[in-house]
Every structure is written in structure tokens, then in C-alpha cells.
Interface confidence: medium
């Protein structure tokens, strides 16, 4: 009821709590001498549903039949209206519309850990919109029943606070939940289980790993578990992997040997527990243990390549390059590389440890037969050395691969193709494709890249260290025993017209012709491989089309003669550069007047 209801009453029949779709009769009646002061027949009783008038009647009482009330609570208020005065509130009532509870479904119980307590969950079904009380009952051995009420609005979970003990693990327990409200009651189907069915062990803890004699092949995982645990699941993976290795063990008693771990790898380990072979559920996974396995000596051999450069009549420079071993081959932190240089006929040898680099340069005599061996060392030992005989890689012309081409292949890739050499193609043991950024000065500090290709291949896709709009000098070597032949080409993965033309730095007169010299375009403005230079000239102050001379691009060339200029005529000259994508803008303009005699 609402307010004190001093002036009258509101009654609701059949009840304040009704089933959805039911009809209610609401009666508002004034108490004696509580009507309008003079004219009791002028009493106007008005019934409001919330703030909306739904009925009125003159007299001492009002009856109203109400249908179609929505789920939830609806407030009805009765007011009295007298002439020349405000409406006076008489009384009110709340009507609660709902449904009987549905049968609770999917009742399930669990006890977390041997020392935990039993908690049950269920699905309530649709909302009753009424105060509904849930009672959870648990019956078990020795005629014992536990029960607990839940008075939350949305009750679908109850923790009994009781701990089931394993004295008789096969004893049956039965749980049942009953929902009751003003409109009815309903009980779930009973759920029957044993201790072993519902106790979910706590996850294992205190996980440790031991490597006997610092060896990855002698590895034991240790952990602690609750006392009744019979089964364990172990899962482990390298920290950078998404896939788990899984092992099931029975009666492990807190330890298990792992035999397939890789050396020098950080692993993540987790363990889960279960009380019975086919009853109950697995515990949550334990917290992760992260541990790095010990190093083992490297396997595999380094991929080694080299470059020779003529210094003078008696000396040559050898630059050695090698690739890092893969993580699985290095099997530890590589501390240094050991390079041994040996003169094969005289037996002289020199060994050096290289740290922090994957290249080494030395100067040796041009005479003699030289060989190098390179190996990688970690804390446990060294890889097998890679041995190479130093030879003139391009000396055998008949071994030179033919028709070498380089074409862009998607983003930052270049497809290099070739034909086998004229000399017996079956003599080729392997091809090596080498590439480096083209620098006009032939800078030996530019990083070298290479890949090896089987003798039956006639193409290779190069993608490592390839940048857009950069020109690469690409060489294909065919190797056969202690001989080699090579061919080279320029290539780029992406190109556009150069950003600027060459800068003419000098024009000199020589025997009736001129020699034009220019500065190379900066590498970052070439925008790919240059194909041609163009030299343009025309008479100063003339409107005629300029003449031009097109010169094929060669890396080392930066001057060119022109002999078609008239003496004592002032010419304007400029240059452009071309890639396969187009021509650059003009370089600087220079004026020149040939002083020589006319022909």
C-alpha cells in the first residue's frame, strides 16, 4: 500500500501479485466523513495508473477492472477531486505482474581443490519479474542433507561453504535446486555425483626445471600437487611459438623427464591435474614456468662467400663474408667466428677470432694457392669449418652463365634468370647469385648479399635487403671444381624517372671537338638503374629544336666527346638521365663556344 491511506482504501482482488495476462479488480473507497466538505455527492474519485487517468466515478467508491498489465510493477493511485480545490491523494497500491518460475536447468556443482567448498550453478530460465527464492539442497551418505537459500534477484549460483572429503570417494551425492515465488514453484532435475566427479583439483604449483650436467637431453620438470592427484597433463612450447607439445602422465608424483627439448630455447611450461582416469575434470593450467634450455655445440656449417680485388702487381685484397647460423643450428650464443687463412703449397696458416662481425678483409700475395676455413663457436664448442679455395671467380669465360636478365617481381623482389654456360652445362656444381647496391665509386664497404642455387636451376628470386628505387649490381657465378665463370647485370625492384639530371662540371676543347665531364647523380636521386645519359645542345638564342646524343650508361663513365659543334658559335648544353620509367629533368645548363678553326 502507498502512503498512510487515512482518507480511504484501495483494495486489489484477487491479489497484489498476479500472473501475466490476468485481470484485477481495483476498488477505491472513502472512509466515513472523508469526502468533499459540503457536497458528498460531488465526490469525484479518479484512478490513476502511474500518472495517467484511467477511470473516475462520482460517489463514495470506485470499481475498476484492469487487464493487460505488463510484466513488472504497476502503481495505481486513487485521488479525490472536489470543486474549487486541488486533487487529494486518497490511497494507492502496487500490483506485481509476473510468472511462475521455470524449472531450473543444467544444475552442476564443483569443488575447487581438496580443501575447497562445494558451489553449484544453474540456469534460472526466463525472468519471473517477481521476488523468487531459490533453495539449493545437497543430500548425501548417512542420511545427511544440506540446504541453503538464495534471495538475490538474479540467483543462479550458491556456494554451500561445505568441503567434501575423500573418505568415501565413490559415495553418491544428489543436488537439487527449487525456485519458489507467489505464483508457483519448480524444482530442477536432481544432479547426482561422487566426490571424484565434482572435485576439480587446484592447479599444480612450485614448478621447477632441472638440467643435469647442463645438458638439454637430461631435463626433469618438478612440481607440487594436491595429495589425491592421479593424472597430469604437461604442455610446453618455445616462447615464440603458438603450438603446444602435450604429454599425459599417470602417477607422476610431481616429476617428469622431457626428452625432446631444443637447446638454447626459451620454453613455457604448464601443468594441469586430475583425480581420476575418467571421472571429474582437469584443473586449470598452472602458472607458466619460463626457462631457457642449455646450449649445445653448433650444428651445420656457415655459408661463406668472398670477393677478390686487385690492388697492384703483387697484392690482392680478399673480403670474406658469411651468414649467421640459424637459431636451430647455432644452439647457443655465438661468441666468435674462427677464420683460418692458409697457403696450400707453403703450409703457412693464420687464424683469427672475429667477434661482432660476419665479414673479414685481408691482403694476400697474388701468388700461391690460398684457402680459408670459417667456423662459429658458442660456449659448448664449434661448428664444422666451411672450407673454400680462393680462386678467380670469373676467370673461366666458358663457364659464364648466358643471357642473364633481372626483372622486377612484385614489391621488393627481383627475379634473376640465366642460361647455362656454353661449356658442358653438366660441369656446373652450383650457381651463386650475388647482389649489392650499385655505387659509382665501386665502394667495397657496400654490404654484399648472395644466395646459392642448385646446378639445374636457371632462375632465382632475390628479396633479402632489396629496396625500392635502388639499382643493384647482380652477378651470377657458375662454379665447377676450382674454376668459375660469371656474368653481371643491373636490376631494380621498382623504378621511376630520376629526380635530377647529371651536373656538367667541365667542358674542354680537344682538337676541334669538346669533352663534356659531369658529376654522377646521387644514388638516392637515380630512382633505379640508369639506362642512358642524354647530352642536349643548341645555339644560344635559337628557337630550333636541340640536338642530342644518347650514351649508354656505364658505371665508371663520367665524360664524353662531341665533335659536331661549329666553331665560334655559342652553344647551350645540358644533360638528362633515363631509367626504364622515363627521363629526368634537365641538369644544369652550360654555355660553350668552340675556338678552333672552321672545317
Amino acid at each position: 500500500k502507498i502512503d498512510a491511506c487515512k482518507r480511504g482504501d484501495v483494495t486489489v482482488k484477487p491479489s497484489h501479485v498476479i500472473l501475466l495476462g490476468s485481470t484485477v479488480n481495483i476498488t477505491c473507497s472513502l472512509k466515513p466523513r472523508q469526502g468533499c466538505f459540503h457536497y458528498s455527492r460531488r465526490n469525484k474519485l479518479i484512478l490513476y495508473k502511474f500518472d495517467r487517468r484511467i477511470n473516475f466515478h462520482h460517489g463514495h467508491s470506485l470499481n475498476s477492472q484492469v487487464t493487460g498489465l505488463p510484466l513488472g510493477t504497476t502503481l495505481f493511485v486513487c485521488k479525490l477531486a472536489c470543486i474549487n480545490s486541488d486533487e487529494i491523494q486518497i490511497c494507492g497500491a502496487e500490483i506485481f505482474v509476473g510468472v511462475a518460475p521455470e524449472q531450473p536447468q543444467n544444475l552442476s556443482c564443483i569443488q575447487k581443490g581438496e580443501q575447497g567448498t562445494v558451489a553449484c550453478t544453474w540456469e534460472r530460465g526466463r525472468d519471473t519479474h517477481l521476488y523468487t527464492e531459490y533453495t539449493l539442497q545437497l543430500s548425501g551418505p548417512k542420511n545427511l542433507t544440506w540446504q541453503k537459500q538464495c534471495k538475490d534477484i538474479y540467483c543462479d549460483y550458491l556456494d554451500f561453504g561445505i568441503n567434501l572429503t575423500p573418505e568415501s570417494p565413490e559415495s553418491n551425492f544428489t543436488a537439487k535446486v527449487t525456485a519458489v515465488n507467489s505464483l508457483g514453484s519448480s524444482s530442477s532435475l536432481p544432479s547426482t555425483f561422487t566426490f571424484l566427479d565434482i572435485v576439480r583439483p587446484l592447479p599444480p604449483w612450485d614448478i621447477r626445471i632441472k638440467f643435469q650436467k647442463a645438458s638439454v637431453s637430461r631435463c626433469t620438470l618438478y612440481w607440487r600437487d594436491e595429495g589425491l592427484v592421479l593424472l597430469n597433463r604437461l604442455r610446453y612450447r618455445p616462447s615464440n611459438s603458438r603450438l603446444w607439445n602435450m604429454v599425459n602422465v599417470t602417477k607422476a608424483k610431481g616429476r617428469h623427464d622431457l626428452l625432446d627439448l631444443k637447446p638454447f630455447t626459451e620454453y613455457e611450461f604448464q601443468i594441469s591435474s586430475k583425480l581420476h582416469l575418467y571421472k571429474g575434470s582437469w584443473s586449470d593450467w598452472s602458472e607458466s614456468l619460463r626457462a631457457q634450455t642449455p646450449e649445445e655445440e653448433p650444428t651445420g656449417m656457415l655459408d661463406v662467400w668472398y670477393m677478390k680485388r686487385h690492388i697492384d702487381y703483387s697484392r690482392q685484397q680478399i673480403s670474406l663474408f658469411w651468414k649467421n647460423l640459424s637459431v636451430s643450428e647455432a644452439r647457443g650464443k655465438i661468441l666468435h667466428y674462427q677464420v683460418t687463412l692458409q697457403e696450400l703449397t707453403g703450409g703457412k696458416a693464420m687464424t683469427q677470432n672475429i667477434t661482432g662481425h660476419t665479414s673479414w678483409t685481408t691482403v694476400i700475395p697474388r701468388t700461391g694457392n690460398w684457402a680459408v676455413a670459417v667456423s662459429a663457436a658458442n660456449s659448448k664448442g664449434s661448428s664444422l669449418p666451411t672450407r673454400i679455395n680462393i680462386m678467380n671467380l670469373c676467370e673461366a669465360g666458358l663457364l659464364a652463365p648466358r643471357q642473364v636478365s633481372a626483372n622486377s617481381e612484385g614489391m621488393d623482389n627481383i627475379l634473376v634468370t640465366w642460361q647455362p654456360p656454353r661449356k658442358d652445362p653438366s660441369a656446373v656444381q652450383e650457381y651463386v647469385v650475388e647482389w649489392r647496391e650499385l655505387h659509382p665509386g665501386g665502394d667495397t664497404q657496400v654490404p654484399l648479399n648472395w644466395l646459392r642455387s642448385r646446378p639445374y636451376n636457371v632462375s632465382a628470386l632475390i628479396s633479402e635487403n632489396i629496396k625500392s628505387y635502388i639499382c643493384y649490381e647482380i652477378r651470377v657465378y657458375a662454379l665447377s671444381g676450382d674454376q668459375g665463370g660469371c656474368s653481371s647485370i643491373l636490376g631494380n625492384s621498382k623504378h621511376k624517372a630520376p629526380l635530377s639530371g647529371p651536373h656538367i662540371n667541365a667542358i674542354t676543347e680537344e682538337k676541334g671537338s669538346i669533352l663534356i665531364s659531369w658529376n654522377s647523380i646521387p644514388v638516392q636521386e637515380q630512382m633505379g638503374c640508369l639506362l642512358h645519359y642524354r647530352i642536349y645542345w643548341k645555339e644560344r638564342d635559337s628557337n630550333s629544336q636541340p640536338q642530342l646524343c644518347e650514351i649508354p650508361y656505364r658505371v665508371s663513365q663520367n665524360s664524353h666527346p662531341i665533335n659536331s659543334l661549329q666553331p665560334r658559335v655559342t652553344y647551350v648544353l645540358w644533360m638528362t638521365a633515363l631509367t626504364a620509367a622515363g627521363e629526368s629533368s634537365h641538369g644544369n645548363e652550360r654555355e660553350f663556344c668552340l675556338q678552333g678553326k672552321a672545317n
Epitope: L144, W146, K148, G161, N163, L164, T165
Partner: nanobody, 124 residues
Framework: QVQLQESGGGLVQPGGSLRLSCAAS????????VGWFRQSPGKEREFVAA????????AYTDSVKGRFTISGDNVKNTAYLQMNSLRPEDTAVYYC?????????????????WGQGTQVTVSS
């Protein structure tokens, strides 16, 4: 030191009612689990009902289910056993017992603290 004090026993006719009280001191209600046991002459002590004072979980043995109701007041640290529809076979000394861990058991060995007992006689 934990002390338990029972009250409310007496003589009652078959079909009548009694309410037993067990007041605990020296222990926090948040950890208190109270059980009622009874013992008739020449018989073993048997479990009747139990309650967790903080959680409200109740337990009953089958022979009293529906007739006896256990309840608790964790402000007063007191447990009550409302006994309705009493029968002559309910005649016994009723003991109140307490422990700090709530486990599924029917054994009086798991209770650490005991009251002196109160006599309930059902007779016409």
C-alpha cells in the same frame, strides 16, 4: 577460550514444540559452524542438524527433515533448533557443538567445542 551454552530443553507432549538455543563466546561468527547432536540412554551420539552462522547453509539428518529447523543469528553468535511435531523417539540429551571448518561429515569427531547438553523429554 571458546564456550557453548545450551538452553530451552524440557518436557513436552508428543506433537508439541520446543526451541533450543546455543550461545557461543570466544569465537568469531564468520568462522563458526554449529551442529546439534543428541544421545539417548544406551545409544551412540547421533547427528541432528548443523548451520554455518555466516553463510546460512543448513544440514539435517533424514529423520528430522521437515520437522526441525536450524537457524542462526551471527550478531548474537547464537544458533537455534526449532523442534516441531515432537515424537517420543526424539527424547534425548541434546548437545550443541562447534568447529571452524565446514566439511561434509556426520562424525562428532570433527567438532572441537562442546556444550554441557540440555534434556528434551517427549512424553504424554
Amino acid at each position: 577460550q571458546v564456550q557453548l551454552q545450551e538452553s530451552g530443553g524440557g518436557l513436552v507432549q508428543p506433537g508439541g514444540s520446543l526451541r533450543l538455543s546455543c550461545a557461543a563466546s570466544g569465537i568469531s561468527s564468520s568462522r563458526l559452524h554449529v551442529g546439534w547432536f543428541r544421545q539417548s540412554p544406551g545409544k551412540e551420539r547421533e547427528f541432528v542438524a548443523a548451520i554455518s552462522l555466516s553463510g546460512g547453509t543448513q544440514a539435517y539428518t533424514d529423520s528430522v527433515k521437515g520437522r526441525f529447523t536450524i537457524s542462526g543469528d551471527n550478531v548474537k553468535n547464537t544458533a537455534y533448533l526449532q523442534m516441531n511435531s515432537l515424537r517420543p523417539e526424539d527424547t534425548a540429551v541434546y548437545y550443541c557443538a562447534a568447529r571452524e571448518r565446514f566439511i561434509w561429515t556426520w562424525s562428532d569427531l570433527t567438532y572441537d567445542y562442546w556444550g554441557q547438553g540440555t534434556q528434551v523429554t517427549v512424553s504424554s
